[in-house]
């Protein structure tokens, strides 16, 4: 139930990468406005994003209080220049998200590899520690500060001139592997956390070679 | 229920070729890797290859290479195996074996294997 | 590649004895191996993984230790259901490899 001219929103979706989290809905408000509340399962509500023609809200400022938390947000639709309105039941129309935990949820971003070092048949690996926007004492936390040993990454590594890609994974940011002496080796890096059953993996990280910047060679 | 389910086994001669599927339920492949391991007549386990569904990422035994190609339909959810150039010693009960990528890395759930004969 | 030397490959036990199986990489795997249970006819089962932690729903008389690039896969007590053949492998690098298979009979 509503008003006459409100429509309640839909297709509430949370977006979420590396803990930065968006809610979205539809539809795209025709005379009408939105106002967006969240909650922890035990908290009160906070509203966000007040009275907005936007059909996202950036909630991030809220879930980094506590990742481990579950989440619930309901988006209130309200009659454009008319926001005290009420529906016939004596409140706002009003549709709940799907819950959401976004330590269990948020997809890992794409990570980068940092840099790479050669000595001699060794090359040590490193991929960088992305910053996100989880906060401890005043300081952003790294992704691997916020998840700890329970984030994994693979590496992908193969000789330029072979197409078969071999396999290395750490619970560190570094690598160190083997390598044929005089061969040049490409790289790539995937995020995983294995005790996930969903969003379990980053995208490929972009393909570095060796030759390329990033690298350095040592006898 | 996580399951694997190998099928396209059978009989086939030296010099063929045959395509083994994997279809996997209960999980979504593409957030895995699919390794195949064979195991001829009386013998212990040997690995074959491994696909990483999410970029293609391929690796095969050398005993293998050049020969089969293994590849993952992730809107089906099924991972493949062709064998081609086929020799009396490929003859062996094929599986299909799910790898939750964690740091060790086990084969966690395997399926029940499907018999190939290379014989004429 | 990384070799998985077991031994040994046949062993005969009797119901509640205790039996040890062994696995040696040839070059350093860290904690990257996994045990498997085979029976005929059947595709192998986790036992272990990083090398001493129990799979769920494995019973507890099965266990696995580390020392060095040698790996050990005890059963405490042995029961009528775990005869069958006992696999190590590793899956530190490209290609994982498996050892050669102990096979568990009946004495």
């Known amino acids: 139930s509503g008003t006459t001219n409100t429509v309640a929103a839909y297709n509430l979706t949370w977006k979420s990468t590396n803990f930065k989290t968006i809610l979205e809905w539809e539809p795209k408000p025709v005379n009408q406005v939105y106002t967006v509340q969240i909650s922890t399962k035990s908290g009160d509500w906070k509203s966000k994003c007040f009275y907005t023609t936007d059909t996202e809200c950036d909630l991030t400022d809220e879930i980094v209080k506590d990742v481990k938390q579950t989440y619930l947000a309901r988006v209130f639709s309200y009659p454009a220049g008319n926001v005290e309105s009420t529906g016939s039941a004596g409140e706002p129309l009003y549709e709940n998200s799907p819950e959401f935990t976004p330590y269990l949820e948020t997809n890992l971003g794409q990570p980068t590899i940092q840099s790479f070092e050669q000595v001699g048949t060794k090359v040590n690996v490193t991929v960088e520690d992305e910053r996100t926007l989880v906060r401890r004492n005043n300081t952003f936390l790294s992704l691997r500060d916020v998840f700890g040993k329970d984030l994994i990454y693979t590496l992908y590594y193969w000789k330029s001139s072979s197409s078969g890609k071999k396999t290395a994974k750490t619970n560190t940011n570094e690598f160190l592997i083997d390598v044929d002496k005089g061969e040049n080796y490409c790289f790539s890096v995937q995020a995983v956390i294995p005790s996930r059953t969903v969003n379990r993996k980053s995208t490929d990280s972009p393909v570095e070679c060796m030759g390329q910047e990033k690298g350095e060679f040592r006898e | 229920e996580v399951q694997l389910v190998e099928s396209g086994g059978g009989l086939v001669q030296p010099g063929g070729s045959l395509r083994l599927s994997c279809a996997a339920s209960?999980?979504?492949?593409?957030?895995?890797?699919i390794h195949w391991v064979r195991q001829a007549p009386g013998k212990g386990l040997e690995w074959v290859g491994y696909?990483?569904?999410?970029?293609?990422?391929?690796y095969y035994a050398d005993s293998v290479k050049g020969r089969f190609t293994i590849s993952a339909d992730t809107s089906k959810n099924t991972a493949y195996l062709q064998m081609n150039s086929l020799r009396a010693e490929d003859t062996a009960v094929y599986y299909c074996?799910?790898?939750?990528?964690?740091?060790?890395?086990?084969?966690?759930?395997w399926g029940q294997g499907t018999l190939v004969t290379v014989s004429s | 590649d990384i070799q998985m030397t077991q031994s040994p490959s046949s062993l005969s036990a009797s119901v509640g004895d205790r039996v040890t199986i062994t696995c040696r990489a040839s070059?350093?795997?860290?904690?990257?191996v996994a045990w498997y249970q085979q029976k005929p006819g059947k595709a192998p089962k986790l036992l272990i993984y990083?090398?001493?932690f129990l799979y769920s729903g494995v019973p507890s008389r099965f266990s696995g230790s580390r020392s060095g690039t040698d790996f050990t896969l005890t059963i405490s007590s042995l029961q009528p259901e775990d005869f069958a053949t006992y696999y190590c492998?590793?899956?530190?690098?490209?290609?994982?490899?498996f050892g050669q298979g102990t096979k568990v009979e009946i004495k």
């Open positions: 209960g999980f979504t492949i593409a957030y895995y890797i």
């Open positions: 070059q350093d795997v860290n904690t990257a």
């Open positions: 990083s090398a001493s």
């Open positions: 696909i990483d569904p999410s970029n293609g990422y391929t």
């Open positions: 074996a799910r790898d939750d990528q964690s740091l060790s890395s086990p084969f966690d759930y």
């Open positions: 492998q590793q899956h530190y690098t490209t290609p994982p490899t």
